[in-house]
């Protein structure tokens, strides 16, 4: 099947680093500098990535592959490839069309990126708040309000041992 | 413009070895890509060996783990080392750089 294929189409075997050239009778050229295929049978290379201005080279192109950016310090990657950069902010903000704002009462973020989020609402767990949530971080929940009643221990007795055939009460 | 010529062809055996040369004149400051081609009787020129613009050296697959690409800066000559030659490595070999073809030089790999 291979042979048949070649023989019908030249361009097949044309390899990644190279294209079909209709201007030299579809043999097999180089790709031009700054430029890659990296897969065989193309037609044509494709221009290289530049990564500039916000976006910086985290590899260089080659003849067979495409350069790829990511992005300069104090900012982030978005989009498949890191086809943007998008301003970080602290930790307790988050990036609005008027740039980075702290988290609202009852919001957190942790990270440098993304959005705040509320505070996890300890009481639909049936459990209390151990810590208190700030900008940057997310309460902590402890142990339900019942558990911590004067007399209640935190320890379960073990089970009353069953004697063989007799079944519980 | 580049001015391209090939040496080193001829008659070998089987099992033998060539090394063709591939000396440059004129501005080979431009070359950024030299390629090796070759072409038998009724058959399309292919693409044998080539130093991409990235300085790295790539091997159709008639040529791969037999054939080393190199370059003489000092000299201005490209070479195409060719080990374990086969009868069907038979052809007319050239040396390319962009719109510049040299003459080609003969390889008969026969017993």
């Known amino acids: 099947f291979e042979r048949t294929r070649s023989l019908q189409d030249p361009c097949s075997n044309c390899p990644a680093g190279t294209f079909c050239d209709n201007n030299r009778n579809q043999i097999c050229s180089p790709c031009p500098p700054n430029s890659f295929s990296s897969a065989g049978g193309q037609r044509t290379c494709d221009i290289c990535r530049q990564c500039k201005g916000v976006f910086r080279t985290r590899k260089e192109c080659s003849s067979t592959s495409n350069a790829e950016c990511d992005c300069t310090p104090g900012f982030h990657c978005l989009g498949a490839g890191c086809s943007m950069c998008e301003q970080d902010c602290k930790q307790g903000q988050e990036l609005t069309k008027k740039g980075c704002k702290d988290c609202c009462f009852g919001t957190f973020n942790d990270q440098k990126r993304g959005i705040c989020r509320p505070w996890t609402n300890c009481s639909l767990d049936g459990k209390s708040v151990l810590v208190n949530g700030t900008k940057e971080r997310d309460v902590v929940c402890g142990p339900s309000p019942a558990d911590l009643s004067p007399g209640a221990s935190s320890v379960t007795p073990p089970a009353p041992a069953r004697e063989p055939g007799h079944s519980p009460q | 413009a580049v001015q391209l010529v090939e040496s080193g062809g001829g008659l070998v055996q089987p099992g033998g070895s060539l090394r063709l040369s591939c000396a440059a004149s004129?501005?080979?400051?431009?070359?950024?890509?030299m390629s090796w081609y070759r072409q038998a009787p009724g058959k399309q020129r292919d693409l044998v060996a080539w130093?991409?613009?990235?300085?790295?050296?790539h091997y159709g697959d008639s040529a791969k783990g037999r054939f080393t690409i190199s370059r003489d800066n000092t000299k201005k000559t490209w070479y195409l080392q060719m080990n374990s030659l086969k009868l069907e490595d038979t052809a007319v070999y050239y040396c390319?750089?962009?719109?510049?073809w040299g003459q080609g030089t003969q390889v008969t790999v026969s017993s």
């Open positions: 004129g501005n080979i400051f431009d070359i950024r890509i």
């Open positions: 130093i991409a613009w990235d300085n790295v050296a």
């Open positions: 390319n750089s962009g719109d510049s």
